[in-house]
């Protein structure tokens, strides 16, 4: 973010805020970057009763406020000025703050509190399971007790639909009300990327509020699923953790569940999907089981629902295989065994080579003997051949 000077606003109360012959004045320092700013009152001559609050970062810009409490009666002879300095932008601002005359009637300025509207996607499991009904949900919060009822309108790809179920508004702990409307949708409409719009209207709103949602755009990528047995260090405890690692999937909508011998397991927790550097996501799921259940050889299955998968589903099972577990003590013992094994292999190779050499020597000796015998035989026969050639007509 680039260097941005602050805007400074004086904060003066109405007479209703003036109590015990004291008045609190304030200064709002808004929209600056980077930190810090310094706030003084009357160039530092006012220091008691000063509170400067920590800065808050919002949308890459900082905002802070400072207040000073001064006597209101008799009126201070001097005006109260807040002095703001922002070194990074070489900005200095002085704002005079004039407390209102205590005799005036309180000025009541009521800014209409507009309710907030939020739209939520369907649960991934509902979208991918035929016997469940996916629903898009629209929630209106901060409705005042005196506000009239809100009306919901729903649109699928800008075509109005009338199948939503709107619940009666519910009172919240802070005495505001909340209103919820749910639109049951077709599985394929969500998967095909249709847009769902919720329009909320009320006499209390200056204008209707609209919120739109659809499936994350982009090519679905199937997750890789790996199961990880409990670490050996955990085997000293009564409970052990089985882990399911689900990686490289897109979009982030995913359901991860566990089964134990074919029945749903309850005692598991999933992380929220976390984005990889390449834009895909990964999730970990941890199932806690009694060590005795693990050691008994029960089968635990990590079940994953994601639109990128064939059948939108895959699962990986995990069970305790004592013969295949190799812990460090065993590995250390194995190191010793490997030393012995190398000795055995060396002796075996030496003996093998010796036997090959011996066989080769014997074979060569025999071949040489046979060869010399044949040569001798040939020499005794050749003269006779010559004689016969010579006798030819």
């Amino acid at each position: 973010a680039k260097t941005t000077p602050p805007s400074v606003y004086p904060l003066a109360p109405g007479s209703a805020a003036q109590t015990n012959s004291m008045v609190t004045l304030g200064c709002l320092v808004k929209g600056y970057f980077p930190e810090p700013v310094t706030v003084t009152w009357n160039s530092g001559s006012l220091s008691s009763g000063v509170h400067t609050f920590p800065a808050v970062l919002q949308s890459d810009l900082y905002t802070l406020s400072s207040s000073v409490t001064v006597p209101s009666s008799p009126r201070p002879s001097e005006t109260v000025t807040c002095n703001v300095a922002h070194p990074a932008s070489s900005t200095k601002v002085d704002k005079k703050i004039v407390p209102r005359d205590c005799g005036c009637k309180p000025c009541i300025c009521t800014v209409p509190e507009v309710s907030s509207v939020f739209i939520f996607p369907p649960k991934p499991k509902d979208v991918l399971t035929i016997t469940l009904t996916p629903k898009v949900t629209c929630v209106v919060v901060d409705i005042s007790k005196d506000d009239p009822e809100v009306q919901f309108s729903w649109f699928v790809d800008d075509v109005e639909v009338h199948t939503a179920q709107t619940q009666p508004r519910e009172e919240q702990f802070n005495s505001t009300f909340r209103s919820v409307s749910e639109l049951p949708i077709m599985h394929q409409d969500w998967l095909n990327g249709k847009e769902f719009k919720c329009r909320v209207n009320s006499a209390a709103f200056p204008a209707p509020i609209e919120k739109t949602i659809s499936k994350t755009k982009g090519r679905p990528k199937a997750p890789q699923v790996y199961t990880i047995p409990p670490p050996k260090e955990q085997m000293a405890k009564d409970k052990v953790s089985l882990t399911c690692m689900i990686t490289d999937f897109f979009p982030e909508d995913i359901t991860v569940e566990w089964q134990w011998n074919g029945q749903p397991a309850e005692n598991y927790k999933n992380t929220q999907p976390i984005m990889n550097t390449n834009g895909s996501y990964f999730v970990y799921s941890k199932l806690n089981v009694q060590k005795s259940n693990w050691e008994a050889g029960n089968t635990f299955t990590c079940s994953v629902l994601h639109e990128g998968l064939h059948n939108h589903h895959t699962e990986k099972s995990l069970s305790h295989s004592p013969g295949l577990q190799l812990d460090e003590t065993c590995a250390e013992a194995q190191d010793g065994e490997l030393d012995g094994l190398w000795t055995t292999i060396t002796i075996f190779i030496s003996l093998f080579l010796l036997s090959v050499c011996y066989s080769a020597a014997v074979t060569l000796f025999k071949v040489k003997w046979i060869f010399s015998s044949v040569v001798e035989l040939k020499q005794t026969l050749v003269p006779e051949y010559k004689n016969m050639i010579g006798q030819a007509p």
């Epitope: 979208v127 035929i130 629902l305």
Partner: nanobody, 124 residues
């Protein structure tokens, strides 16, 4: 060749019962979850019920819970949908679909095989 053939549909009065069958051939039913779907006139196809490959897990859409029962007989390579207390809104073409896996889910996509459907009409 792989086939799923639905049968048992017909005209029935409201409150009546029907049993649909999904006969499979060309593959071993033991390894497949089976889902029943229906499509009402002018509407999209929707899931009705699901049974896992072992038969150990069954699921129903809310609108048919307590009225429909899904079951399977792997020896006969057949899956059944017993439909009681039928309502006019149950009218439609009923399809079965097969998913190759042992999970307890019938999902909204990725079916391996589909049948051609059987018509159920609930009317007085």
């Amino acid at each position: 060749q792989v086939q799923l053939v639905e049968s048992g549909g017909g005209l029935v009065q409201p409150g009546g019962s029907l049993t649909l069958s999904c006969a499979t051939s060309g593959f071993s039913l033991d390894y497949y979850s089976i889902g029943w779907f229906r499509q009402a006139p002018g509407k999209e196809r929707e899931g009705v019920s699901c049974i896992s490959s072992t038969g150990g897990s069954t699921n129903y859409v809310d609108s048919v819970k307590g009225r429909f029962t899904i079951s399977r007989d792997n020896a006969k390579n057949t899956v059944y949908l017993q439909m009681n207390s039928l309502k006019p809104e149950d009218t439609g073409v009923y399809y079965c679909a097969a998913y190759r896996r042992s999970g307890a889910y019938c999902t909204s996509g990725g079916q391996d095989y589909w049948g051609k459907g059987t018509l159920v009409t609930v009317s007085s």
